[in-house]
């Protein structure tokens, strides 16, 4: 299921009917497209240009992160008169042109979405031949990738004074709420969420002092689902054994 946010333009400058954009460069992209991790998403991008009946060589490009300078994730080239845009770059083979650049459509399909794909994408078209011209979307389209929680790490670590602490790190979007349960903790003790710097989808919760042996369970939950993982603490001769 792919969701595209349609923006209702609040044009507060005046009520004049605008002349057709067909004689100018312009690009139309939605502000945002949403899809779940593992699914595919379509990033729509259409354009208009001033070069009537242009039939020369063209290149379609999509880049990620920032306009004009971000890394390319997809590039294809069409020869003069050709409707086929030959793929020259498709990062990890997951990007595929759905649109026909000859018909002013650069729409892109992204397969097997991962949380790391959650960023902005910018479409660009370049004309080469008799006409040398290019245009790129400035604000781009934000690909919002959602994902059910997944616990990526759970561990028991030694802490000062022969004590132990437990760490649980989960990923998901929306970022999951984490809770610990275990011996003498009561049922589902809520832990403080702490999204890690630079890892917007990762959340870590710490149980600072494990006072009893036994099974400690971390539960991660968001609107798309929940995930659990456990770690076991057995203290013998001042050592700990932990397994998940």
């Amino acid at each position: 299921f792919v969701r595209t946010k349609i923006d209702t333009t609040e044009n507060l400058l005046n009520t004049e009917v605008h002349s057709s954009p067909a004689q100018r460069w312009s690009m139309q992209v939605p502000p945002e497209v949403s899809a779940e991790a593992g699914d595919a998403a379509v990033l729509p991008c259409t354009f208009t240009h001033p070069h009537r009946h242009y039939d020369g060589p063209l290149t379609a490009i999509w880049r990620a992160g920032e306009p004009y300078a971000g890394p390319q994730v997809f590039r294809c080239a069409a020869a003069r008169g050709s409707e086929l845009c030959q793929t020259a770059l498709s990062l990890h083979g997951r990007f595929r042109l759905l649109g026909n650049p000859r018909r002013n459509d650069l729409s892109l399909r992204v397969e097997r979405l991962a949380l790391a794909d959650d960023r902005r994408y910018f479409c660009r078209v370049e004309f080469a031949g008799d006409v040398h011209d290019r245009y790129e979307s400035r604000h781009g389209v934000r690909l919002h990738v959602t994902a059910a929680p997944r616990i990526v790490n759970i561990s028991v670590l030694p802490s000062p004074a022969h004590a132990f602490r437990a760490l649980c790190t989960a990923e998901g979007e929306p970022p999951p709420a984490l809770a610990w349960s275990g011996p003498a903790l009561g049922n589902s003790l809520a832990a403080v969420r702490s999204p890690r710097e630079g890892h917007g989808h990762l959340v870590t919760a710490e149980l600072p002092a494990l006072t009893h042996d036994g099974r400690y369970t971390c539960t991660a939950a968001n609107s798309l689902g929940r995930s659990e993982a456990s770690v076991y603490l057995f203290r013998f001769h001042g050592a700990s054994g932990a397994s998940t």
């Epitope: 923006d7 460069w25 312009s26 139309q28 400035r138 604000h139």
Partner: antibody
Framework: EVQLQQSGTELVRPGSSVKISCKAS????????MDWVKQRPGQGLEWIGE????????NYNQKFKGKATLTVDKFSRTAYMELSSLTSEDSAVYYC?????????????????WGQGTLVTVSA | ENVLTQSPAIMSASPGEKVTISCSAS?????MYWYQQKPGSSPKPWIY???NLASGVPARFSGSGSGTSYSLTISSMEAEDAATYYC?????????FGAGTKLELK
């Protein structure tokens, strides 16, 4: 009625930082980008950068990268610009300006609304 | 960056006179935007997407152009038109303004 209300005049020391604010009202804050523009006394306009309040994505003029940091607080509907390592060259009026429609290049209408400006004076 | 060159930098016009302010871009742009600014005030949107008048702008103003050459025209100068006018492009990074044309009343 759309309004952009900026914080007041700032007199700051060289080398220090200043954070100026722009409170938006009268429209859906997250639907429009917010831009910042610099105008030195008697001079023209210079674009600093822009921020999308919906996700805090920023796009800077390379010249101001490292000098200006743009942020927003969605809940208070306020955009901020922090200027660091101030010198006399940073003495100027700074405007926030609301960009046109959200994303499509064709629907961009220029800066439809401007704040009243914040005068920043850098002086020892 | 796309440099916008406005001409003239300063000009004066008599009431009723036709005025044309030019803005030349160092590389092609899709649309040009114009702002009016008076001393002590914020810039005001004046013309957007090359030829559309912003709300409240008198019909004696018009805008035209394409590619690298754009202009703002006042068909008949009035006293309230005395101000500085800036052109601006949005087609490439960074967004740039012209240096301004100061229009004075003769």
């Amino acid at each position: 009625e759309v309004q952009l209300q900026q914080s007041g005049t700032e007199l700051v020391r060289p080398g220090s930082s200043v954070k100026i604010s722009c409170k938006a009202s009268g429209y859906t804050f997250t639907r429009y980008w917010m831009d910042w523009v610099k105008q030195r006394p008697g001079q023209g306009l210079e674009w600093i950068g822009e921020i999308d309040p919906s996700d805090s994505y920023t796009n800077y003029n390379q010249k101001f990268k490292g000098k200006a940091t743009l942020t927003v607080d969605k809940f208070s509907r306020t955009a901020y610009m922090e200027l660091s390592s101030l010198t006399s060259e940073d003495s100027a009026v700074y405007y926030c300006a609301r960009s046109g429609a959200y994303s499509s290049d064709y629907s961009y209408d220029g800066f439809a609304y401007w704040g009243q400006g914040t005068l920043v004076t850098v002086s020892a | 960056e796309n440099v916008l060159t406005q001409s003239p930098a300063i000009m004066s016009a008599s009431p009723g006179e036709k005025v044309t302010i030019s803005c030349s871009a160092s590389s092609s742009v899709s649309y040009m935007y114009w702002y009016q600014q008076k001393p002590g005030s914020s810039p005001k949107p004046w013309i957007y997407r090359t030829s559309n008048l912003a709300s409240g702008v008198p019909a004696r103003f018009s805008g035209s152009g394409s590619g690298t050459s754009y202009s703002l025209t006042i068909s008949s100068m009035e006293a309230e038109d005395a101000a500085t006018y800036y052109c601006q492009q949005w087609s490439s990074n960074p967004l740039t303004f012209g240096a301004g044309t100061k229009l004075e009343l003769k």
